[in-house]
């Protein structure tokens, strides 16, 4: 069974799937489409590199420019290093700027929603 | 066959509101934005603003913040959206337009609502 | 906003005649984020042309698209009376989405 194949099979059990199984799905080609994206749960996506998103969707990863501005693509996007966001080419903006620490203060975190910044 | 439906003219009066509805057959609903346009004589076409109706998230054109509420009902796959405190700049003709997910542009727009502000 | 300005805001051509119309972006546009709708009088806009080339299904072949960073165009190789419409370009390349003025093309 190819990527996609599987891919269909599991496609609607994927709403709640953890990190892990999307990292894991990440590595099986399966090209998952922005509708089933935007599906996932947003704890679950904030932890994904760029690389493993761009994995995840495969061809359709150029769709995350035009919900740039929707959860949990926002999120995510808020997530990331800008020059991470930018080797993908799509002009997604709103990343982590060069020079910036990203401290993982769950509490800050949970409290305003966004990562805590050091500037350089 | 793809549809969106909306609603005839309205006439309102000024400081008043309006709800139109667009509903939505022939697709999967949940797979696609809801958009809505504005286009009037003096603007042209302008953007309002766009729902997600999996997750009811918005987005808006500043322009239209606190003018444009967009709403959606799932189970009758149908979209709305309520214009507030109008006033003669609003005059225009309303459409709805699907915008499948990741993409940007409108594959299929809806009739078209004309909302005519006038006492 | 990125505004797209559109010209001619009204022309006319004869048939067989080649119609090109442009659209110019006040900033640079990736590509993929620029398509073109039609009009008719009277009635909903509908998608003609999107990621600047790609037709939209029902369009016929003499009709294409091209452009790059700020200037982009629609161009009828062979202009038929059915093509007679308004023509608007729209970006997606930044919010809010914006809109050209429109071409209002005419048969002569």
């Known amino acids: 069974m190819n990527g996609s194949e599987y891919f269909v099979k599991i496609q609607s059990f994927l709403g709640g799937a953890p990190t892990e199984d999307l990292k894991a799905l990440s590595q099986q080609n399966v090209s998952m489409d922005l509708a089933t994206f935007m599906k996932l749960r947003t704890d679950a996506v904030l932890p994904l590199t760029v690389a493993e998103v761009q994995k995840l969707l495969g061809p359709h990863v150029e769709g995350l420019k035009a919900e740039e501005r929707h959860r949990p693509v926002r999120d995510w996007i808020l997530r990331q290093r800008q020059d991470d966001l930018d080797t993908l080419g799509l002009g997604l903006q709103g990343g982590i700027p060069n020079g910036y620490l990203v401290l993982d203060l769950s509490m800050q975190e949970a409290l305003s929603g966004t990562p805590c910044l050091l500037g350089p | 066959e793809v549809q969106l439906q909306q609603s005839g003219p309205e006439l309102v009066k000024p400081g008043a509101s309006v709800k139109i509805p667009c509903k939505a057959s022939g697709y999967t609903f949940t797979d696609y934005n809801m958009d809505w346009v504005k286009q009037s004589h003096g603007k042209g076409l302008e953007w309002i603003g766009d729902i997600n109706p999996n997750t009811d998230d918005t987005i808006y054109n500043q322009k239209f913040n606190g003018k444009a509420t967009l709403t959606v009902d799932k189970s009758s796959s149908t979209a709305y959206m309520e214009l507030r405190s109008l006033t003669s700049e609003d005059t225009a003709v309303y459409y709805c337009?699907?915008?499948?997910?990741?993409?940007?542009?409108?594959?299929?727009w809806g009739t078209g609502t004309t909302v005519t502000v006038s006492s | 906003q990125i505004v797209l300005t559109q010209s001619p805001a009204i022309m006319s051509a004869s048939p067989g005649e080649k119609v090109t119309l442009t659209c110019s972006a006040s900033?640079?546009?990736?590509?993929?984020?620029l398509c073109w709708y039609r009009q008719k009088p009277g009635s909903s806009p509908e998608l003609w042309i999107y990621?600047?080339?790609n037709l939209a299904s029902g369009v016929p072949a003499r009709f294409s698209g091209s452009g790059s960073g700020t200037s982009y165009s629609l161009t009828i190789s062979s202009m038929e009376a059915e093509d007679a419409a308004s023509y608007f370009c729209h970006q997606w390349s930044n919010y809010p989405y914006t809109f050209g003025g429109g071409t209002k093309l005419g048969m002569k």
């Open positions: 900033s640079s546009v990736i590509s993929t984020y």
């Open positions: 990621s600047t080339s």
């Open positions: 337009s699907r915008r499948l997910i990741g993409t940007g542009y409108f594959d299929v």
